[in-house]
Amino acid sequence: IWSAVFLNSLFNQEVQIPLTESYCGPCPKNWICYKNNCYQFFDESKNWYESQASCMSQNASLLKVYSKEDQDLLKLVKSYHWMGLVHIPTNGSWQWEDGSILSPNLLTIIEMQKGDCALYASSFKGYIENCSTPNTYICMQRTV
């Protein structure tokens, strides 16, 4: 069963989110389940490291963008949120928390600031930001 859920604080328009765990999940209570991923948008502003710790404490990680098709709800996300993308100064690469290197196919990086962390914005954009700047954040948990 699908329900058109309008989450005004999170998304720019109506987003289809499944409500039954038989189609998606299981996810932690009150998290959004979408195409075999669990997401939670946290309103409190934390720096990147605190955001990462918060996600880890809930057995999750910061958002990883791995597929536009599977994560098409991210196209509509409002505002800017920490995701799990960091610059590794030792090798110069931009990597996800799991060590995989960001593919330019998945995110267009916009270099507004100097920094080693990145904020997710709508339409698969990533904005470079200083890791110590407080921002809201998105946690993600894979269900499969």
């Epitope: 536009k68 110069g92 690469s93 290197i101 330019p104 196919n105 267009t108 990086i109 339409s123």
Partner: antibody, heavy 117, light 107 residues
Framework: QVQLVQSGAEVKKPGASVKVSCKAS????????MNWVRQAPGQGLEWMGR????????HYNQKFQGRVTMTVDKSTSTAYMELSSLRSEDTAVYYC??????????WGQGTLVTVSS | DIQLTQSPSSLSASVGDRVTITCRAS??????LAWYQQKPGKSPKVLVY???TLADGVPSRFSGSGSGTDYTLTISSLQPEDFATYYC?????????FGGGTKVEIK
């Protein structure tokens, strides 16, 4: 196997427009940016721009801004590049190129566009 | 927009020589650099991506290195089939560009 098949050679008059097509097969068309690159006779490669077939987002080389339009037809997995207000300096081979994870991993065979009065 | 300056624009070398081509970016491109080989009348072919990873099927005599703004393609022992033009290209941010190319000719 991945294939990018481009339309045939074109001869155009100065001031006219040209539209080159690139039919993709062998991969999920909407998952990878499609790029257009040109090469004038005896010259180097010049990136013209790219389009995301997923949502038709485009980024163009500033040099071509206002003259180039990139589009896709998802139903036929075909990308198009239209260049307007042609001049003799636009005589070149035009390539489409699929963005792999970290490089242009597949290229079309090229389309020669000749601009001559 | 980040520009790439490739050098030299051409070089003459003999079979067995070690050849080095450099590519300098006008800003940090964070290893988002690929190297291509192009032969006359043919489409380019990727050799190296992420600055140092060899593409599938590319002989091990090719190698890439560098970080930040300075990158290098090295051919450890030039073979007859390596005489071609080589291009670097970056994928950082929204606008992607090629270097001017390096033509490797037979001495």
């Amino acid at each position: 196997q991945v294939q990018l098949v481009q339309s045939g050679a074109e001869v155009k008059k100065p001031g006219a427009s040209v539209k080159v097509s690139c039919k993709a097969s062998g991969y999920t068309f909407t998952s990878y940016w499609m790029n257009w690159v040109r090469q004038a006779p005896g010259q180097g490669l010049e990136w013209m721009g790219r389009i995301d077939p997923y949502d038709s987002e485009t980024h163009y080389n500033q040099k071509f801004q206002g003259r180039v339009t990139m589009t896709v037809d998802k139903s036929t997995s075909t990308a198009y590049m239209e260049l307007s207000s042609l001049r003799s300096e636009d005589t070149a081979v035009y390539y489409c190129a699929k963005m792999g994870d970290y490089s242009f991993d597949y290229w079309g065979q090229g389309t020669l566009v000749t601009v001559s009065s | 927009d980040i520009q790439l300056t490739q050098s030299p624009s051409s070089l003459s070398a003999s079979v067995g020589d070690r050849v080095t081509i450099t590519c300098r970016a006008s800003g940090n491109i964070h290893n988002y650099l690929a190297w291509y080989q192009q032969k006359p009348g043919k489409s380019p072919k990727v050799l190296v991506y992420n600055a140092k990873t060899l593409a599938d099927g590319v002989p091990s005599r090719f190698s890439g290195s560098g970080s930040g703004t300075d990158y290098t393609l090295t051919i450890s022992s030039l073979q007859p089939e390596d005489f071609a033009t080589y291009y670097c290209q970056h994928f950082w941010s929204t606008t992607w560009t090629f270097g001017g190319g390096t033509k490797v000719e037979i001495k």
